[in-house]
Interface confidence: low
Amino acid sequence: QPPPPPPDATCHQVRSFFQRLQPGLKWVPETPVPGSDLQVCLPKGPTCCSRKMEEKYQLTARLNMEQLLQSASMELKFLIIQNAAVFQEAFEIVVRHAKNYTNAMFKNNYPSLTPQAFEFVGEFFTDVSLYILGSDINVDDMVNELFDSLFPVIYTQLMNPGLPDSALDINECLRGARRDLKVFGNFPKLIMTQVSKSLQVTRIFLQALNLGIEVINTTDHLKFSKDCGRMLTRMWYCSYCQGLMMVKPCGGYCNVVMQGCMAGVVEIDKYWREYILSLEELVNGMYRIYDMENVLLGLFSTIHDSIQYVQKNAGKLTTTIGKLCAHSQQRQYRSAYYPEDLFIDKKVLKVAHVEHEETLSSRRRELIQKLKSFISFYSALPGYICSHSPVAENDTLCWNGQELVERYSQKAARNGMKNQFNLHELKMKGPEPVVSQIIDKLKHINQLLRTMSMPKGRVLDKNLDEEGFESGDCGDDEDECIGGSGDGMIKVKNQLRFLAELAYDLDVDDAPGNSQQATPKDNEISTFHNLGNVHSPLK
């Protein structure tokens, strides 16, 4: 071992450096001292450090470490925060479009229903938004409430418009009859399945992204232990006590110190990897009825079909309801259902193919690809931090925590450190409580993500086929399908171009007697070109 170089005879360099950390020189010896009170930078000879300086170095070292950790996670944190915000906003926009399409369908096809239909549609989509954001709302109840509310209005306005106001207490009976007589056929059940599956997946996707932010925030703001502070001080600052201002720590030594300091954080690695892979699996399955964009933007069409189903069976229904709700109705009123030949009994629900621009689906896949580049983020952290702090290349002529060495030897360094602190002991302490908590949250979300991962291939439930509904003609290579209607496929040019303004607000919503209903902008109308005889809301 080469002897330590003689310290600066006046401690001048140390004084000028330390003054940058702590204005005032009262703690810095003018000339080297024995340093018998030092606890971290244990001297092999005279030293330019005092106990107070050591404490300041420890504080600075821990702050440096926190800053390095924060800059290490900055890109990842920004990626998740930005995407969580983008997706949350995008989902709100999808909900708004879906509401507008549905309102437009009512306005154009069933104007007599509009004042109240707008209200029910508004309430339904409000609940959809709240559910996505985590509210404790039952999707089946939402759908039931929509159809329960719609049927009395359909019955009194379309099927039996002669009904006087005095007979309005028929509503309660009509709500009950709606379910008992399955007046909308299997459409409510179809919508329940599609909406609940797609919203569940959407909700957990957002939850997972928000947890990702929480994980990064937790590790970003970790307070490092005193032991770690001592190790960092020894690595970064103890060389100064010997007047070695330009010497860099050995790379191998830095890795050992960082692994010791980050032992708890690195424990997240296993669960973080699983989180990204589970999220990828979820995203890969978010298509057809598991894609809220497809499901919600196609709802207007399914609701339209459901009303046609009622109208088709209006004759039979009016008679049955007349008997069923006789106590609410003194006499039968003229029935105004449409001639049956106007309606096609569709056994197969056609599905619509969405033309890709920048869809939510492609945005999700892009996010997963970027996240996968951070899959080893936690296991690579010690190495990352060492590579972003000053270390000697090739471990030659570098500081090993005690002295300047020509070549770093981990074994020698460990032996030399034995009496000062125990790296192994530092690792054995286990993660901090906050890290343990975040690991538990990761375990929980990973479990949820796994249970939510969708089957590949045909995804529409068999139980929806009872009344001849089928999943339609979407091939496996087409991963954007909407439960639609009509005799041909609806071509829906995708609305969600992320960098576009996206402020489309048809706003035929919510109020009875809205005298200022805006019409869709021209570019929105062109969205529904070449529709043939399909029931587009904007025709």
């Epitope: 709100e92 909900v95 508004g122 409000t126 938004s129 509310s149 009194t156 509503n171 919503d509």
Partner: antibody, heavy 119, light 112 residues
């Protein structure tokens, strides 16, 4: 024509109870979310309670939570407000009003009001 | 709770004049869905309030087009282009973006 007619107001002692009713006609009551709004003697308006169209959801501001209960009987086209543990600051004209939904509602139609005096 | 502040408290006008009432909220009324739920009501003497304008600028059914609403975020205005005798009364602004719903203190429109 939409009509909302409140009743049940009157003079009551602090700590007492009162039940207000609102009879609706001229529209499909069952399909509307409903609210009670009160107007203080100083003419300030305060939202008091909300119930969704099917009656499944109710909401109250903190000032009345635990003391007031909103309910509806869709068969009778009637809205109710059960008020208990009344305080002098509950003195107001109470209006029933129809609205769309909690998150995006506005009070489209109002009754003529019923006066509650707590003294 | 969101505090709604109306100015002026009283607004004396001559018939045929333009009137303008201001309403300011203590926080933004832009809902996460992009809509702004700021509404205006008129209470004529001896009557219950009536809805005039919903969502900043939409006139309710039967409301004359001399009434218009504008504004965004936290600052909103109700304008009456030519005041008529039947417009006299107390005007209230109200928000339903945040629960609980809250109202402004009112602005009394009266004849000079």
């Amino acid at each position: 024509e939409v009509q909302l007619v409140e009743s049940g107001g009157g003079l009551v002692k602090p700590g007492g109870s009162l039940k207000l009713s609102c009879a609706a006609s001229g529209f499909a009551f069952i399909t509307y979310g409903m609210s009670w709004v009160r107007q203080t003697p100083e003419k300030r308006l305060e939202w008091v309670a909300y119930i969704s169209s099917g009656g499944a959801n109710t909401y109250y501001p903190d000032s009345v939570k635990g003391r007031f209960t909103i309910s509806r009987d869709n068969a009778k086209n009637t809205l109710y407000l059960q008020m208990s543990s009344l305080k002098s600051e509950d003195t107001a004209m109470y209006y029933c009003a129809s609205l769309s939904t909690l998150v995006r509602g506005w009070f489209a139609y109002w009754g003529q009001g019923t006066l509650v005096t707590v003294s | 709770d969101v505090v709604m502040t109306q100015t002026p408290l009283s607004l004396p006008v001559s018939l045929g004049d333009q009137a303008s009432i201001s309403c300011r909220s203590s926080q933004s009324l832009v809902h996460s869905n992009g809509n702004t739920y700021l509404h205006w009501y008129l209470q004529k003497p001896g009557q219950s309030p009536k809805l005039l304008i919903y969502k900043v600028s939409n006139r309710f059914s039967g409301v004359p087009d001399r009434f218009s609403g504008s504004g965004s975020g936290t600052d909103f205005t109700l304008k009456i282009s030519r005041v008529e005798a039947e417009d006299l009364g107390v005007y209230f602004c109200s928000q339903s973006t945040h629960v609980p719903y809250t109202f402004g203190g009112g602005t009394k429109l009266e004849i000079k």
